[in-house]
């Protein structure tokens, strides 16, 4: 299922980097979230629970990330013009069933004021 454009502010700039916000519904308990740049997987985070309700959080493609009860934030640093692209949050919902995949995204525009280490 492709949801299309994110209906929230997906990119938050600070200190020459960007926080990319990938939201998911509060009811989702177990999932995989991938950050795609174009068609390439940049980062991922998987949250699962065992039979004793213990939480496991894994990253195969590691980026600095932050998990909350309804979002995963991925952080990209040292921005330059090559970072300008379409970015997508690819959410695979394991729990609650049924299994479902949603894709939301937007275009990351890079302006001079947002670049790290500008030459004066």
């Amino acid at each position: 299922e492709i949801n299309g454009s994110a209906n929230y502010e997906m990119f938050i700039f600070h200190n020459g980097g960007v926080q990319i916000l990938c939201k998911y519904p509060d009811i989702v308990q177990q999932f995989k979230m991938q950050l795609l740049k174009g068609g390439q997987i940049l980062c991922d985070l998987t949250k699962t629970k065992g039979s004793g309700n213990t939480v496991s959080i894994k990253s195969l493609k590691f980026c600095h990330s932050q998990l909350s009860n309804n979002s995963v934030s991925f952080f990209l640093y040292n921005l330059d013009h090559s970072h300008a692209n379409y970015y997508f949050c690819n959410l695979s919902i394991f729990d609650p069933p049924p299994f479902k995949v949603t894709l939301t995204g937007g275009y990351l525009h890079i302006y001079e004021s947002q670049l790290c280490c500008q030459l004066k």
Epitope: Q29, K49, G50, S51, N53, K58, F94, D95, P96, P97
Partner: antibody, heavy 117, light 111 residues
Framework: EVQLVESGGGLVQPGGSLRLSCAAS????????MDWVRQAPGKGLVWVSN????????EYSPFVKGRFTISRDNAKNTLYLQMNSLRAEDTAVYYC??????????WGQGTLVTVSS | DIVMTQSPDSLAVSLGERATINCKSS??????????LTWYQQKPGQPPKLLIF???TRQTGVPDRFSGSGSGTDFTLTISSLQAEDVAVYYC?????????FGPGTKVDIK
């Protein structure tokens, strides 16, 4: 089709050791938590242990903690249970089970462990 | 540890009649909007089979004569019209916390 096949059971003396194996196929083994559940003859089901997808988290029933060790080899799609200091009350059929996110959705046929002198 | 109890220990029901099994937990299994309660069926000489998860959601392929209900600490498995192939032991199970525990089981036979 998900398949779980246990092996390694048998007769062992009290105080002895045994290593059970569970060969998994038909799914991406490294994506799932896995568990061991046992059933004494004519009795009910008792959870023994679980392990997360890459083996970094393991949990144990109070009955076996300190004596049993669960592990997995994702390259071989195999789950293990190392059982030491076995007691007569550990006699049971041991089932390997896949934790399918919110329930045990697949079970092996079980392997019988008998602890007796 | 959460203690699971089941009643009755066994029951015999005529073919086509309703069978009702109760399960009680020593503390609430409700977290958010989910009850962490599962039902399994075990036929003689076979491993358990998943019937119902989250207290009331039928596993794919399970006949609709099986239904689960309840919330918090009190749960029920109902077989609306017992068939010969339903002769088995039925277990409730919680995964609210560690260690997960099973009820002692309820044996269902044909009267």
């Amino acid at each position: 089709e998900v398949q779980l096949v246990e092996s390694g059971g048998g007769l062992v003396q009290p105080g002895g050791s045994l290593r059970l194996s569970c060969a998994a196929s038909g799914f991406t083994f490294s994506d799932y938590w896995m568990d061991w559940v046992r059933q004494a003859p004519g009795k009910g089901l008792v959870w023994v242990s679980n392990i997360d997808e890459d083996g970094s988290i393991a949990e144990y029933s109070p009955f076996v903690k300190g004596r049993f060790t669960i592990s997995r080899d994702n390259a071989k799609n195999t789950l293990y249970l190392q059982m030491n200091s076995l007691r007569a009350e550990d006699t049971a059929v041991y089932y390997c089970s896949r934790w399918g996110r919110f329930a045990f959705d697949s079970w092996g046929q079980g392997t019988l462990v008998t602890v007796s002198s | 540890d959460i203690v699971m109890t089941q009643s009755p220990d066994s029951l015999a029901v005529s073919l086509g009649e309703r069978a009702t099994i109760n399960c009680k937990s020593s503390q609430s299994l409700l977290s958010g909007s989910f009850n962490y309660l599962t039902w399994y069926q075990q036929k003689p000489g076979q491993p358990p089979k998943l019937l119902i998860f989250y207290a009331s959601t039928r596993q794919t392929g399970v006949p609709d004569r099986f239904s689960g209900s309840g919330s918090g600490t009190d749960f029920t498995l109902t077989i609306s019209s017992l068939q010969a192939e339903d002769v088995a032991v039925y277990y409730c199970h919680h995964h609210y916390n560690a260690p997960p525990t099973f009820g002692p089981g309820t044996k269902v036979d044909i009267k």
